[in-house]
Amino acid sequence: LPAQVAFTPYAPEPGSTCRLREYYDQTAQMCCSKCSPGQHAKVFCTKTSDTVCDSCEDSTYTQLWNWVPECLSCGSRCSSDQVETQACTREQNRICTCRPGWYCALSKQEGCRLCAPLRKCRPGFGVARPGTETSDVVCKPCAPGTFSNTTSSTDICRPHQICNVVAIPGNASMDAVCTSTSPTRSMAPGAVHLPQPVSTRSQHTQPTPEPSTAPSTSFLLPMGPSPPAEGSTGD
């Protein structure tokens, strides 16, 4: 027998269900057509006539195949701390997400109901865990040798600059200040005021041999177990 194609509305076989994009109307006791996204059921089906669909009005929508008598209302306009990431159309609701610098403190099915500003870490504190769309920033105190001098939701604690000579030591909220190239001051015989390096020589001269050898400028550098001075500890 040739396959039978049933056109809606039709009575389903006992124990069977309606096909995709159809629904069973209890009143008519028939399988009837659903309305496509962006539409709603203006007139429900009967035993002899199929569903009559109509387009959603402005500011309403249906996102799925449906047989609802009225389209759903789009959500209210996004608040000032939000951005509209999806506009209200006949087929989709408006979606509001938090604008940069904010996170979603209370979410809804799609988008965010309540945004809150990301925490700013004050000077002396840096970001331990960055904020995400749904979580706030976590701050931590800057460890010794690091600092943050900003009030910021993104800045981490940074290492103090390494000075040849430190003019002002750094702390948790301030970088170290170096003397380098600062004017020298007069000094008493055994006194020292601010250093600055200089090495001189001409023609190749041999350095006095060192037990361990470091680079030697023709007489220079004994290199031994110690790491390069650039990396040596202390400020």
């Epitope: 390494i162 000075c163 040849n164 000579v165 430190v166 003019a167 002002i168 030591p169 170290a176 003397t179 380098s180 600062s182 020298t184 001051r185 000094m187 020292v192 005021h193 601010l194 250093p195 600055q196 390096p197 200089v198 090495s199 350095p207 060192e210 470091a214 680079p215 030697s216 400028t217 007489f219 220079l220 550098l221 004994p222 290199m223 031994g224 110690s226 790491p227 390069p228 001075a229 650039e230 040596s232 500890t233 202390g234 400020d235």
Partner: antibody, heavy 108, light 104 residues
Framework: PELVAPGASVKISCKAS????????MNWVKQRPGKGLEWIGR????????DYNGNFRGKATLTADTSSSSAYMQLSSLTSVDSAVYFC?????????WGQGTTVTVSS | SLAMSVGQMVTMSCKSS????????????LAWYQQTPGQSPKLLIY???TRLSGVPDRFIGSGSGTDFTLTISSVQAEDLADYFC?????????FGSGTKLEIE
């Protein structure tokens, strides 16, 4: 100038100012006439960390007092080869400013 | 030692037994000092070519790796001094034997 007898010890001091003494390395350098400059070692006054030239280990001992911003170098078992001018100079790498130097003369 | 006339250009060299170039910073760890008679050494140049604030621009440091030069573009009478290089790449720091600059 320091005049000391052979076999004796001498402690040279260096008073620092104008920078963060506790946070900066202090170096000591020896200069003998006609012999150029020799780096003896350095100390970090903040934590007492020291770094010596192997040639001066056992000869020089570096200390520092942060309360007075002073660095010290003790030279022991002095001989004539220890007669020299000794300079202190702060710097992690290069020596930014040098003290005027202390002359040590070892003589009986 | 070098004997030069005022206004002449002078160059002094400093050679290291190993490279003084720090790869992470691309800086050469070499300094130049001037010691005038009866005075303490004074820093002129560090990181091979950085002139200390206040040092006349006739003093020019150059070079990389193992070979370095201090140039005085136009010697002045007050430049009469000993000049030393120092590697500040690793400890123990070491100095060059020095160049004595004499003015004719």
């Amino acid at each position: 100038p320091e005049l000391v007898a052979p076999g004796a010890s001498v402690k040279i001091s260096c008073k620092a100012s104008g920078y963060a003494f506790s946070h900066s390395w202090m170096n000591w350098v020896k200069q003998r006439p006609g012999k150029g400059l020799e780096w003896i070692g350095r100390i970090h006054p903040g934590d007492g960390d020291t770094d010596y030239n192997g040639n001066f280990r056992g000869k020089a001992t570096l200390t520092a007092d942060t309360s007075s911003s002073s660095a010290y170098m003790q030279l022991s078992s002095l001989t004539s080869v220890d007669s020299a001018v000794y300079f202190c100079a702060p710097g992690r790498w290069y020596l930014e400013v040098w003290g005027q130097g202390t002359t040590v003369t070892v003589s009986s | 030692s070098l004997a030069m006339s005022v206004g002449q250009m002078v160059t002094m060299s400093c050679k290291s037994s190993q490279s003084l170039l720090t790869s992470s910073t691309q800086k050469n760890s070499l300094a130049w000092y001037q010691q005038t008679p009866g005075q303490s050494p004074k820093l002129l140049i560090y990181f091979a070519s950085t002139r200390l604030s206040g040092v006349p621009d006739r003093f020019i440091g150059s070079g990389s790796g193992t070979d370095f030069t201090l140039t005085i573009s136009s010697v002045q009478a007050e430049d009469l001094a000993d000049y030393f290089c120092q590697q500040h790449y690793s400890t123990p720091f070491t100095f060059g034997s020095g160049t004595k600059l004499e003015i004719e």
